[in-house]
């Protein structure tokens, strides 16, 4: 049993490790980037394609804060959101409503991610809290699934081994406040 | 499914040290936080210290600092826990547990026993 | 170091009945709160966290409660499989502490 998505109160999505959620259906109070990309896979024929490298789909950035009970990121992270239906890549629009989407009529792509990296993030807290560690699992690019009749969601959330490592260098530790002096912290079971 | 395996019981002698091993699977480690917990027999838990995998962070309970040393090998996902200068009052269950923060314990290792005496 | 104070140390209940186990920390901390369900021979579960958030497949019979330095768990109707030892712990301030735990045993 892994990390749960946990949706908080600002309806963000927060992935959480272990678990990989779907998109969001829309993006509502997150300030999108409004950059598509397809995911480095070539255009090739539009309307013939048969292998799922043919086809693309659009990974818009976004940014959000993480919320932890009370706390909250001191900075917004930026992460992905697998978007729309896969087709063509050349037929995929270059930007959020300009063109039009290509609808298959044969075996249904999905636009799912791909590969996830883990980012540790500082929380702080109301009432002198002092910050806490915490670390989310972020989407780090998406890609078309042909989907059956025999696909489940399950198998729609592939493990991002190969995510992307943060960066090396050491990051400033979370120092523990004294019994005066609180610092912390604290999050989710069973 | 999220898992953590822990190395066999070990009996020592006062003033050696243990190496406590845990094999994480399910994730990688490096995407966690790694915590050992102890608990005497019939005791109540104690917090020995927290690292982060990915960059070598560490936290240790001061009561424990320059005893023990927290440490992961990435590439096995598995994460070691050494003790030195044992004594008695050391002997324990030690668990490995992990999770996405640093101030609370997801999922725990079934635990190593370790056993102080001369 | 925070003294978590759990109370009672021990209880006896009955399959059904509604069980409340407290814990007092010795100042502040917060809603930083955990507690955790342990078996005999067997390694810690966590239940709640941030005092009253269940976590992932705990059932909806357990919950959490309280801010500062009082918290408590309440089961409202006790299950078989719930016979264990319970304790609170503290993530507000390192080291983190843990209650000395409370055995919820069979009438």
């Known amino acids: 049993q892994g990390w749960q998505a946990f949706k908080n109160d600002a309806t963000e999505i927060i992935p959480e490790l272990g678990e990989y959620p779907e998109p969001p259906p829309e993006l509502e109070n997150n300030k999108t980037m409004n950059r598509a990309e397809n995911g480095g896979r070539p255009p090739h024929h539009p309307f013939e394609t048969k292998d799922v490298s043919e086809y693309s789909c659009r990974e818009l950035h976004f940014t959000r804060y993480v919320t932890d009970g009370p706390c909250r990121s001191a900075k917004p992270v930026t992460e992905l959101v697998c978007s729309g239906q896969c087709g063509p890549a050349r037929l995929l629009p270059n930007a959020i409503g300009r063109g039009k989407w290509w609808r298959p009529s044969g075996p249904d792509f999905r636009c799912i991610p791909d590969r996830y990296r883990a980012q540790r993030v500082q929380l702080l807290c109301p009432g002198g809290e002092a910050p806490r560690a915490r670390k989310v699992r972020l989407v780090a690019s998406c890609k078309c699934k042909r989907l059956t009749r025999f696909h489940n969601q399950s198998e729609l959330k592939d493990f991002g081994t190969e995510a992307a490592r943060p960066q090396k260098g050491r990051k400033p530790r979370p120092r523990a406040r004294s019994a005066k002096a609180n610092q912390a912290e604290l999050e989710n079971a069973y | 499914q999220v898992q953590l395996v822990q190395s066999g019981a070990e009996v020592k002698k006062p003033g050696a040290s243990v190496k406590v091993s845990c094999k994480v699977s399910g994730f990688p480690i490096k995407d966690t936080f790694q915590h050992w917990v102890r608990q005497a027999p019939g005791k109540g838990l104690e917090w020995m210290g927290w690292s982060d995998p990915e960059i070598g962070d560490t936290e240790y309970a001061s009561k424990f600092q320059g005893r023990v040393t927290m440490t992961e090998d990435t590439s096995t996902d598995t994460a070691y826990m050494e003790l030195s200068s044992l004594r008695s009052e050391d002997t324990a269950v030690y668990y490995c547990a992990t999770g996405d923060t640093t101030y609370k314990f997801d999922f725990w290792g079934q635990g190593t026993t370790v056993t102080v005496s001369s | 170091d925070i003294q978590m104070t759990q109370s009672p140390s021990s209880l006896s209940a009955s399959v059904g009945d509604r069980v409340t186990i407290t814990c007092k920390a010795s100042q502040d901390v917060h809603t930083a709160v955990a507690w955790y369900q342990q078996k005999p021979g067997k390694a810690p579960k966590l239940l709640i966290y941030?005092?009253?958030t269940r976590w992932t497949g705990v059932p909806s019979r357990f919950s959490g409660s309280g801010s500062g330095t009082d918290f408590t768990l309440t089961i409202s109707s006790l299950q078989p499989e719930d016979f264990a030892t319970y304790y609170c712990q503290q993530g507000d301030t390192l080291p983190y502490t843990f209650g000395g735990g409370t055995k919820v045993e069979i009438k």
């Open positions: 941030w005092a009253s």
